[in-house]
């Protein structure tokens, strides 16, 4: 099991939507989910 | 909007491979996990592998591992999945899926 | 590996009443870290399959709030309030507790 990652569910979880304040801020990166870097948490 | 398009169809004959394509858009494609997904005719859904495109680094499906290779070319942001030594129970819709995201699929029909 | 399994079909429903569909894993799917690693996918007639909920009970973006999910390690449920016609299709839970990923055979959702 990929333990260098926080969950196991790195590979589906999908983008979360942002909360409503960060929603027009200039970092587009995922909040959740594969987006992370692939080198892990 | 985030893409991931599929060639419709292959008609490859046994014995023989085929390659098949998956082109990412929309979004960063070097970030993503992208999984390889079949389908038979009428059947469920199983899980083939899947390859981070900014390492190569792949994990597969143990039932595949001889049938299928999982490769990316960064520079066209497409991710590939050869299949080899085909046969009649390779013919099916397969997917290629980034999480929320799946591609068209492509109906490959293995047949003399 | 972890076996997924759903009834083929669900008990007809009509038009705007609830509908559930149940799903079994061979192993619980509820993890120390207090995550249960259930999903559930719908796949419409003719098209790819959609992520519909995600780690059991949370709903993926653009999904609709007639969908919920529950259920314990081992058993779960998808429910449907208010079916409607473009809920037709085929319901599929997987497992992303463990490689390989696995799906169960698919419930498909009958409208009377």
């Known amino acids: 099991q990929a333990t260098e990652y926080e969950y196991l569910d790195y590979d589906f979880l999908p983008e979360t939507e942002p909360p409503e304040m960060l929603r027009n801020s200039t970092d587009t990166t995922p909040l959740t989910g594969p987006g992370t870097p692939e080198s892990g948490k | 909007q985030v893409q991931l398009q599929q060639p419709g169809a292959e008609l490859v004959k046994p014995g023989a491979s085929v390659k098949l394509s998956c082109k990412a858009s929309?979004?960063?494609?070097?970030?993503?996990?992208m999984h390889w997904v079949k389908q038979r005719p009428g059947q469920g859904l199983e899980w083939i592998g899947m390859i981070h495109p900014n390492s190569g680094r792949t994990n597969y499906n143990e039932k595949f591992k001889s049938k299928a290779t999982l490769t990316v070319d960064k520079s066209s942001s497409t991710a590939y999945m050869q299949l080899s030594s085909l046969t009649s129970e390779d013919s099916a819709v397969y997917y290629c899926?980034?999480?929320?995201?799946w591609g068209q699929g492509t109906t490959l029909t293995v047949s003399s | 590996d972890i076996v997924m399994t759903q009834a083929a079909f669900s008990n007809p429903v009509t038009l705007g009443t609830s509908a559930s569909i149940s799903c079994r894993s061979s192993?619980?799917?509820?993890?120390?870290?207090?995550?249960?690693?259930l999903y559930w996918f719908l796949q419409r007639p003719g098209q790819s399959p959609q992520l519909l909920i995600y780690r059991m009970s949370n709903l993926a973006s653009g999904v609709p709030d007639r969908f919920s999910g529950s259920g314990s390690g081992t058993d779960f449920t998808l429910r449907i309030s208010r079916v409607e016609a473009e809920d037709v299709g085929v319901y599929y839970c997987?497992?992303?507790?463990?490689?390989?990923?696995?799906f169960g055979g698919g419930t498909k959702l009958e409208i009377k």
């Open positions: 929309g979004y960063t494609f070097t970030s993503y996990w």
């Open positions: 899926a980034r999480s929320d995201y």
């Open positions: 997987a497992q992303m507790l463990e490689f390989p990923r696995t």
């Open positions: 192993k619980s799917l509820l993890h120390s870290d207090g995550i249960t690693y």
